[in-house]
């Protein structure tokens, strides 16, 4: 889970081992800081829970893609 208590950078030390339904998701952010042990994606759920996920997993990439597509404002 995210840990930012003693550091200015939020890092992930463990990844969720279950796929999260996209229905649960509100947003995500990528963790790429060299101060963190591994690259990660932190999903924020619609009830404001933060969940660390492995960006190498296909479901994580698909979920980010889904959020990206629906977040874009349609051009008029």
């Amino acid at each position: 889970q995210p840990d930012a208590i003693n550091a200015p950078v939020t890092c992930c030390y463990n990844f969720t081992n279950r796929k999260i339904s996209v229905q649960r998701l509100a947003s995500y952010r990528r963790i790429t800081s060299s101060k963190c042990p591994k690259e990660a994606v932190i999903f924020k759920t619609i009830v404001a829970k933060e969940i660390c996920a492995d960006p190498k997993q296909k479901w994580v990439q698909d979920s980010m893609d889904h959020l990206d597509k629906q977040t874009q404002t349609p051009k008029t």
Partner: antibody, heavy 119, light 112 residues
Framework: QVQLLESGAELVRPGSSVKISCKAS????????MHWVKQRPGQGLEWIGW????????EYAPKFQGQATLTADTSSSTAYMQLSGLTSEDSAVYYC???????????????WGQGTTVT | DIVMTQSPLSLPVTLGQPASISCKSS???????????LNWLQQRPGQSPRRLIY???KLDSGVPDRFSGSGSGTDFTLKISRVEAEDVGVYYC?????????FGQGTKLEIK
């Protein structure tokens, strides 16, 4: 299509408990959180809390902590809310609802039960 | 808790005319992720609530495009471009940015 079917009206005594059910159909209940909302007669809406049916995680509004207990049974696609220590202030319609900002090709969705009246 | 204040509380409107409802929050609803979790609900007489708008301005499926939402920070507006008879009911704003989720006190729309 998605439906949330709540149990029937309840007439209860002060100090007693009541357990309301919300049966989901048309989607996998484990895929999303189930929320509960209170509406007193002629009044507005109050959020009670949510349950994650997949693992039983819950979160309650401070006002309802200790009075409301949310549970779910994925095998029967049913969510439950138990209210204890009932008083006249708890006479209300209680709604279950599930919603998302994303999740379909169109975008978000929101579904509500028909409400259970507790008197 | 975040207080959501709606105005007016009662809104008599002539059929075919526009209507506007204001919702002000006691704190900004802009979340740390850059999104604003402000929604609008409609509750017709004797019915369950129904979400009309989410994330300030996105219309739910099946909601007529005469409804629109706008705003940012602490000030939000629901507009109906031309009121129809089926629009009668109570409208609530609802925030999901801060715990616990809270609702406005409701605006009752009626036909003049």
């Amino acid at each position: 299509q998605v439906q949330l079917l709540e149990s029937g009206a309840e007439l209860v005594r002060p100090g007693s408990s009541v357990k309301i059910s919300c049966k989901a159909s048309g989607y996998a209940i484990k895929d999303n959180y189930m929320h509960w909302v209170k509406q007193r007669p002629g009044q507005g809406l109050e959020w009670i809390g949510w349950i994650d049916p997949e693992n039983g995680d819950t979160e309650y509004a401070p006002k309802f902590q200790g009075q409301a207990t949310l549970t779910a049974d994925t095998s029967s696609s049913t969510a439950y809310m138990q209210l204890s220590g009932l008083t006249s202030e708890d006479s209300a319609v209680y709604y279950c609802n599930t919603w998302a900002y994303y999740g379909t090709s169109y975008g978000g969705f929101a579904y509500w039960g028909q409400g259970t009246t507790v008197t | 808790d975040i207080v959501m204040t709606q105005s007016p509380l009662s809104l008599p409107v002539t059929l075919g005319q526009p209507a506007s409802i204001s919702c002000k929050s006691s704190q900004s609803l802009l979340d740390s992720d850059g999104k604003t979790y402000l929604n609008w609900l409609q509750q017709r007489p004797g019915q369950s609530p129904r979400r009309l708008i989410y994330l300030v301005s996105k219309l739910d499926s099946g909601v007529p495009d005469r409804f629109s939402g706008s705003g940012s920070g602490t000030d939000f507006t629901l507009k109906i471009s031309r009121v129809e008879a089926e629009d009668v009911g109570v409208y609530y704003c609802w925030q999901g940015t801060h715990f616990p989720q809270t609702f406005g006190q409701g605006t009752k729309l009626e036909i003049k």
